[in-house]
Amino acid sequence: APVRSLNCTLRDSQQKSLVMSGPYELKALHLQGQDMEQQVVFSMSFVQGEESNDKIPVALGLKEKNLYLSCVLKDDKPTLQLESVDPKNYPKKKMEKRFVFNKIEINNKLEFESAQFPNWYISTSQAENMPVFLGGTKGGQDITDFTMQFVSS
C-alpha cells in the first residue's frame, strides 16, 4: 500500500544539524550559511505501528538513498544504525519493526522513540561533531528533542 511521506531536515534542540559521517553514520554539529547544504534530508514516512494515543509511527529514510535508520542489538545494547534496503520495496506501510520510530510531538518539539526498544530515543550529545545514537535516557545530558523543517524541492 502507498504511504504518506515528506522531505525534511531535523535539528536538535541546541540547533545542531545532522550530517553524514562516513557511509553509515550521522553526526550532529552546528552549521551556518552555505554549510547548511551539508545537512541530511530525510524522507519521513507514515507507517504501521502499535496502537497508541499520542505516538505516530514513522520510518526515517535518507532522501534519494536506499538507507534507513534502524535499531538493532549490538553487543547486547540497542544501537542506531543506517541500513541499506532494496529501493524497489521501500518505503512500505508495514515496515519491519527495527525501522519504526514512534514520533512524539510536544510543543513543536519531536522525539523519536524506537518501536523495537521502548524508551530508547534518537539522541545527540551536547558536544559538537559526535555521532547520532540511540539513548536510553530522557531529560539527562543527552539531547532527545528535535525540530523539523520541510525541505522545498
Epitope: P2, S5, L6, I56, S152
Partner: antibody, heavy 119, light 108 residues
Framework: EVQLVESGGGLVQPGGSLRLSCTAS????????MAWVRQAPGKGLEWVGI???????YYASWAKGRFTISRDTSKNTVYLQMNSLRAEDTAVYYC?????????????WGQGTLVTVSS | EIVMTQSPSTLSASVGDRVIITCQAS??????LSWYQQKPGKAPKLLIY???TLASGVPSRFSGSGSGAEFTLTISSLQPDDFATYYC??????????FGQGTKLTVK
Amino acid sequence: EVQLVESGGGLVQPGGSLRLSCTASGFSLSSAAMAWVRQAPGKGLEWVGIIYDSASTYYASWAKGRFTISRDTSKNTVYLQMNSLRAEDTAVYYCARERQIFSGDMAGWGQGTLVTVSS
Amino acid sequence: EIVMTQSPSTLSASVGDRVIITCQASQSIDNWLSWYQQKPGKAPKLLIYRASTLASGVPSRFSGSGSGAEFTLTISSLQPDDFATYYCQNTGGGVSIAFGQGTKLTVK
C-alpha cells in the same frame, strides 16, 4: 493566536479554473501540514488533499489531475488550484491544519470560502 | 479505499439524554479515527482523536471508544449546545483520509 483565512472563492463557469488561497498566522507553514476539505451545500465533509513539503502532496482519488495543492512558505500561504470545474464542485472549501504531522486529524480550520460553478 | 459508514444518519434526542453515534470502517484502521462536530454555517471542530483522546477544550461529557473497524461517539448527558452534525474520519488509511457521511443530531 492561530488563524487560517481562505480567499479566492466566487462564481465560475463550468470548465473554468479558480485558485483559492489560505493564509496562516500564529504559526509557520515551514513545518505544518495543511489540508483542504470541501462541503457541498447540505452535504457532508469531503477530503480534497494535503500538502507537507512542496513535493509531498496527497489527494482524494476524485481530485487527482484536476486539483493541485501548493504552498508559498515566504507568504505563509497554501493554495488550491482547481481546473476543469464542474457543477458538482460547488461547495464551501475549508483549509485546515493537521494537528500533528501524519496524525490525519485537523485541529485548526479556516472559515471557508464558497465556490459556485454555474453558467 | 476505506469507506466510513455512520449510523444513524439523523438522531432526535432531548437535553439530558445519553446519545451514541456509531462509525464503521470497511476494513481495520486500528485506532486511527477522529470525531468532529459541525454547526450550521461554521467550520468543523475536532472533538476526539485516536478513537478515544479528547481534543483540547472539549467537555468531558464527550467520549470515544472502539478499535479496528467499529467505533462509537458517546455524549453522556446532552446539552443544548450539542445539537449539531457529527462526522467520523479515518485518519490512518494510507494516502487518503475519508470522512463518514455525518449524523445530524436534532431536538426531539
